[in-house]
């Protein structure tokens, strides 16, 4: 699998992974003890036909062209978890691996 | 996990799974021996904030609102394989489980 990586200076218009630091403090989410911030990344860009298609299904739907089907969109195709320490709302503090918090790769699906 | 199912008569505007039969013969893909056609399904519809969001990450990116980040889009969140019998282009015929050929659930990501 393959995905493009970009930054704020990139001129790339196609589907790409961009850096993004999520700051829980800035959101006012004080129930999260740690981390205060983390590198989440995000996906943005255009999905021209066949470029970075994750699934053969995406190609087949394009071929079949059903009513109302939009073209593929730029979305996470590989994600990873982070460990978090947080209040769970029942006066307990939990340490847990929270899935799908970091975008590792972007693609068209 | 939860996802909406619709059909061609539905008035649902939100992200939904629709039925779609892919016909390999109609595509002229004669290298596929079996199946001749299969139920692939596809995703279509609007992704309003928080509706059917697959990942907490989607919510966080919306909060952070970086440059160029589109809203979440309606895309497969659960897929399954089908078994296919096909010519591999090297005068061999292969039976294989081809991943991500059927959309089982749609969501916003």
């Amino acid at each position: 699998d393959f995905g493009l990586d970009c930054d704020e200076h990139s001129t790339e218009s196609r589907c790409c992974r961009y850096p993004l630091t999520v700051d829980f403090e800035a959101f006012g989410w004080d129930w999260i003890i740690a981390p205060k911030r983390y590198k989440a990344n995000y996906c943005s860009g255009e999905c021209e036909f066949v470029f970075l298609q994750k699934y053969p299904h995406t190609h087949l739907v394009h071929q079949a062209n059903p009513r109302g089907s939009a073209g593929p969109c730029c979305t996470p195709t590989k994600m990873s978890p982070i460990n978090m320490l947080y209040f769970n709302g029942k006066e307990q503090i939990i340490y847990g691996k929270i899935p799908a918090m970091v975008v590792d790769r972007c693609g068209c699906s | 996990d939860f996802g909406l199912d619709c059909d061609e008569h539905s008035t649902e505007s939100r992200c939904c799974r629709y039925p779609l039969t892919v016909d390999f013969e109609a595509f002229g893909w004669d290298w596929i021996i079996a199946p001749k056609r299969y139920k692939a399904n596809y995703c279509s519809g609007e992704c309003e904030f928080v509706f059917l969001q697959k990942y907490p990450h989607t919510h966080l990116v919306h909060q952070a609102n970086p440059r160029g980040s589109a809203g979440p889009c309606c895309t497969p969140t659960k897929m399954s394989p089908i078994n296919m019998l096909y010519f591999n282009g090297k005068e061999q015929i292969i039976y294989g489980k081809i991943p991500a050929m059927v959309v089982d659930r749609c969501g916003c990501s």
Partner: antibody, heavy 116, light 107 residues
């Protein structure tokens, strides 16, 4: 009703050639891959060749590769097997079969005897 | 090439008996295994495809199971018309190969 009728078998000398035909009816011939399978007298089954629905792709075992050629004429609903450089071990009943995940319909076969 | 080994090579059974035929592949073939029935002087007939799917028009007393390397054809209650030779065939990769056959005879 699916029907497959083989013809063209007979007695041929070693080194000779023969062309088998299989006339198909009862289904959309151009939509399906087709296969040939043979059975030597008193023996088991042996796959000989398969051709894709449009005729673009073919496959053979090593035992016949380079000597046998499978082809089809979708306008005539007919499958062919051109057999060259025939050997005694090619003696068998040759069956054509409609191909899906498996060979789901078979003809009654035509006997090819290779002998001097 | 993938070798297919059938057992037993022959068996004697009575009408109403439950009959089991096994087929073993020399390597894993997923569920790409088909079963055929052949009567003397006749063409083979497909019974089971993809290891366990019953071919249209085949009586439900025939069933198939297995995946990987070990497969089974079961006739739940043998009928007079079931006395024949049965072949397994792998369609996992070419060259497609058949088992040596199992002849089911009347006891």
């Amino acid at each position: 009703e699916v029907q497959l009728l083989e013809s063209g078998g007979g007695l041929v000398q070693p080194g000779g050639s023969l062309r088998l035909s299989c006339a198909a009816s009862g289904f959309t011939f151009s939509s399906y891959a087709m296969s040939w399978v043979r059975q030597a007298p008193g023996k088991g089954l042996e796959w000989v060749s398969t051709i894709s629905s449009g005729g673009s792709y073919t496959s053979y075992p090593d035992s016949v590769k380079g000597r046998f050629t499978i082809s089809r004429d979708n306008s005539k609903n007919t499958l062919y097997l051109q057999m060259n450089s025939l050997r005694a071990e090619d003696t068998a009943v040759y069956y054509c079969a409609k191909q899906d995940y498996a060979m789901n319909y078979w003809g009654q076969g035509t006997l090819v005897t290779v002998s001097s | 090439d993938i070798q297919m080994t059938q057992s037993p090579s022959s068996l004697s059974a009575s009408v109403g008996d439950r009959v089991t035929i096994t087929c073993r592949a020399s390597q894993s073939i997923s569920t790409a295994l088909n079963w055929y029935q052949q009567k003397p002087g006749k063409a083979p007939k497909l019974l089971i495809y993809s290891a366990s799917s019953l071919q249209s028009g085949v009586p439900s007393r025939f069933s198939g199971s297995g995946s990987g390397t070990d497969f089974t054809l079961t006739i739940s209650s043998l009928q007079p018309e079931d006395f024949a030779t049965y072949y397994c065939q792998q369609s996992y990769s070419t060259p497609w190969t058949f088992g040596g056959g199992t002849k089911v005879e009347i006891k």
